[in-house]
Amino acid sequence: EPPTACREKQYLINSQCCSLCQPGQKLVSDCTEFTETECLPCGESEFLDTWNRETHCHQHKYCDPNLGLRVQQKGTSETDTICTCEEGWHCTSEACESCVLHRSCSPGFGVKQIATGVSDTICEPCPVGFFSNVSSAFEKCHPWTSCETKDLVVQQAGTNKTDVVCGPQDRLRHHHHHH
């Protein structure tokens, strides 16, 4: 009865277990009773990343600059090229096939997490006591100015888009004139 299974680094062919080709190599010919599996290294710009019986290597990914892509890690005979996006852009998918511009956080919102090559900017609304008056991909919400520490008083209340306006203390409140 011929074998129906093989060990992990082998494959079944013609009722025989033949050695798989190592990563970085492709299958040229199957083994026989007396000859080993014949494998050949992948060519330039090609790869195979697993023990395999592939007769053709895979082409390295092309990082198309027209799509905002650049090479993050050059491929080898055992690994594919890894693409990432140009500065200010991020990948639209995990496979990073194209890029889009990082979003900016509108006034009233601050940057919670700065964008990376693979993730967009994460914005958050400025809570009470904080503001953002710009549209930015980097700026966090800033705390309102503390008038008291400058020996000033609040003349105009702050909002999520504007800072408080401080002014001098009203002297009349502090100096009572007696007639």
Partner: antibody, heavy 127, light 107 residues
């Protein structure tokens, strides 16, 4: 230290069942293929069964099909051999062994061998 | 199934002797053969894999050769600790099989 330790052997009546265990330590058990090999008193080695690292693939010697079942629990670093419908001719020392794939990237083809063995557990089938 | 036949079944030799054990396969197995040493009451110990590659920590007096159907294990100069039983095993395909063993005894 890389170690395999079998347990679960003993005396059992013909037709009975037994479950052998093999506890692995000192290596990443879930990355290795494993085997059971037995040796009847005063006799040679006989391969019994094989299991892949994930447990997905198994194979058996004709002499134990379909009575024996090999399985593994990678979360517990344990290999098992469930033995049913035992016969007198199953009497032997049962060893678990680690299958290793030796590979030198400069060479064309790798090779398998069983590089780590347990001390064995004795199974006696007798009435 | 692939049958492995070892010869001789037993062998008597002296310390310092050169000893050769052969293993013949019923069909071609390329170089998918391993050799083991076993001492009484102990588990087998891997000596050679892939027909000719020496396992780490095994003394260089042990060597393996052959491919296809005919294989040999050679001990260039026997040491007292080498007296044991030797087995060949094919890992070419399932079911894996062992030779019947060669018992090496002291003269």
């Amino acid at each position: 230290e890389v170690q395999l330790l079998e347990s679960g052997g003993g005396l059992v009546r013909p037709g009975g069942s037994l479950r052998l265990s093999c506890a692995a330590s000192g290596f990443t058990f879930g990355s290795y293929e494993m085997d059971w090999v037995r040796q009847a008193p005063g006799k040679g080695l006989e391969w019994v069964s094989y299991i892949s690292s994930s447990g997905e693939t198994t194979d058996y010697a004709d002499s134990v099909k379909p009575r024996f079942t090999v399985s593994r629990d990678n979360s517990k670093n344990l290999l098992y051999l469930q033995m049913n419908s035992l016969r007198a001719e199953d009497t032997a020392v049962y060893y678990c062994a680690r299958d290793v794939f030796f590979f030198d990237s400069s060479g064309d083809n790798g090779a398998y061998g069983m590089d780590v063995w347990g001390q064995g557990t004795m199974v006696t089938v007798s009435s | 199934d692939i049958q492995l036949t070892q010869s001789p079944s037993s062998l008597t030799a002296s310390v310092g002797d050169r000893v050769t054990i052969t293993c013949r396969s019923s069909q071609g197995i390329r170089s998918s053969l391993a050799w083991y040493q076993q001492k009484p009451g102990k588990p087998p110990k891997l000596l050679i894999y892939g027909g000719s590659s020496l396992e780490g920590g095994v003394p260089s007096r042990f060597s393996g050769s052959g491919s296809g159907t005919d294989f040999t294990l050679t001990i260039s100069s026997l040491q007292p600790e080498d007296f044991a039983t030797y087995y060949c095993q094919q890992l070419n395909s399932f079911p894996s099989t062992f030779g019947q063993g060669t018992k090496l005894e002291i003269k």
